[in-house]
């Protein structure tokens, strides 16, 4: 807290300019009018204030707007945004995507801070849903943003927003998140033709069920091993050797290198060895010839 002192003669700020960098904290407090600061916030970002000085400017704005800053001020906060606490931000009503972009720009290159997380939360809640433009903006600044949301939060993403998602945006998503996103992506891309559809849906396939993988195997998609390894184990297990061969196309040879890893390992254990042998890859661990395979889960379902 800066002590309350009278502004020295001749030092009253008539505008926000670089001469203020020479002011002490108490002088900024005494000589800069909060209303002037609010109307000239766009200048603050161009002036090399110290963090100590920014503290004073923030304090002045806090006094002027105890219920929270208006968006006209928020949009021009610049580096002053870094001084805001999540509690400060919860008082704001940010509706403009331009304001959001301006503040995200300040934090660019850094991990998502609690301030940024709160800002995004306030913005998205204010909009009611995560629309395409917002998602586009957020993933541009934070490629991992989508995967930071809970499955419940992801459920509010409209299918139309899926068009904004890039493959790298899904890199850190877990199966539960992909379970929510995959049906949305399937719906979003449903009118695309086979090869184009596969290119778009590929990143979301970690949430695909068995029947969709079977359907894809009939379309000569040539899925790469990296995508295959991200598929749900329970979705891969029912696939036949022939279906996996069609699904992977020329990439099927990569199964050998992955035979000890899930889901390939678990899938191999479910296949007949003589079916695996038809691949000519030397995959071992399948069910020996002459053995009967009982699907206990099917038996339980029937009883």
């Amino acid at each position: 807290e800066v002590e309350k002192t009278a502004c020295p003669s001749g030092k009253k700020a008539r505008e926000i300019d670089e001469s203020l960098i020479f002011y002490k904290k108490w002088e900024l407090e005494a000589c800069v009018d909060a209303a002037l600061l609010a109307t000239q916030m766009d200048r603050v970002n161009a002036i090399p204030f110290t963090y100590e000085q920014l503290d004073v400017l923030k304090h002045k704005l806090d006094e002027l707007y105890p219920q929270g800053y208006p968006e006209s001020v928020i949009q021009h906060l610049g580096y002053l945004f870094l001084k805001m606490s999540p509690e400060d931000i919860r008082k704001w009503n940010v509706t403009s995507l331009e304001t959001l972009k301006a503040l995200l720009e300040v934090n660019k290159g850094h991990e998502m801070s609690p301030q940024v997380a709160t800002l995004i939360d306030r913005f998205v809640k204010g909009r009611g849903q995560l629309d395409k433009d917002t998602l586009d903006t957020l993933t541009a600044f934070y490629p991992g943003y989508l995967c930071s949301l809970s499955p419940e939060e992801l459920s509010s993403v409209p299918p139309s927003s899926i068009w904004a998602v890039r493959p790298q945006d899904l890199d850190t998503c877990d199966p539960r998140q992909l379970d929510v996103l995959y049906p949305k992506a399937r719906l979003a891309f449903q009118n695309m033709n086979g090869s184009e559809y596969f290119v778009k849906i590929q990143s979301f396939l970690g949430g695909a069920p068995t029947e969709d993988l079977k359907a894809l195997s009939q379309q000569n998609v040539s899925m790469d091993l990296a995508t295959f390894m991200k598929l749900r184990t329970d979705a891969v297990l029912p696939l036949t050797v022939a279906e996996v061969q069609k699904l992977l196309g020329p990439h099927v040879e990569g199964l050998k290198a992955e035979e000890r890893h899930r889901p390939v390992r678990d899938w191999i254990l479910r296949q007949r060895q003589d079916d695996l042998d038809t691949l000519g890859l030397g995959l071992q661990g399948g069910i020996p010839n002459g053995y009967l395979v009982l699907d206990l889960s099917m038996q339980e379902a029937l009883s």
């Epitope: 002590e3 020295p8 030092k11 670089e18 001469s19 960098i21 020479f22 002490k24 904290k25 108490w26 002088e27 090399p48 110290t50 100590e52």
Partner: antibody
Framework: QVQLQESGPGLVKPSETLSLTCTVS??????????WGWIRQPPGKCLEWIGN???????NYNPSLKSRVTISVDTSKNQFSLKLSSVTAADTAVYYC?????????????WGQGTMVTVSS | EIVMTQSPSSLSASVGDRVTITCRAS??????LAWYQQKPGKVPKLLIY???TLQSGVPSRFSGSGSGTDFTLTISSLQPEDFATYYC?????????FGCGTKVEIK
Amino acid sequence: QVQLQESGPGLVKPSETLSLTCTVSGGSISSSSYFWGWIRQPPGKCLEWIGNIYYSGSSNYNPSLKSRVTISVDTSKNQFSLKLSSVTAADTAVYYCARLPRGDRDAFDIWGQGTMVTVSS
Amino acid sequence: EIVMTQSPSSLSASVGDRVTITCRASQGISNYLAWYQQKPGKVPKLLIYAASTLQSGVPSRFSGSGSGTDFTLTISSLQPEDFATYYCQQSYSTPFTFGCGTKVEIK
């Protein structure tokens, strides 16, 4: 290790302009963490602050000298300069350049060796 | 402008003595005060800033105290290399102003 070195004529005629340059070595004058200043000390008298400058060119002067003083910066040469116009014998002094860390309770932490300037015809 | 008045203007002391120099500001300056040491023909050297913070590399026998208008520089045990002139300076508001110095001489 940052060092400052003043340079300029040691003798200036009355009514002329005193010009001094301070060269910063061992560090960049363009650091956002410092102001750069000029201070003078007339023989046997008190130290007097002349003014400060930031690498952007923004400056701040002693009101008693403001009408006659100009401090400028040349970041490409890592130098800042002092010009004092219409000099009189009262401007005879040792002139120091110094570094001032930017902070609320700042103080001149590095000084040049000082250069004696005599105003005489 | 803020006028800084130092006292005494000079003093004589012996090695090992405790020496106290005072500086008074013409108005309150909180703790915006620095102390410098200057030896004959040499450059002023920063000892203390913010009234009591010791500058890096300065011996701990030097200490500063005070706030508002009255400040003190203390040398707990005077050493031969401490014989010099000491200046105070306020940085509360521009123009920055200096005291006219206290000369510490050998008794």
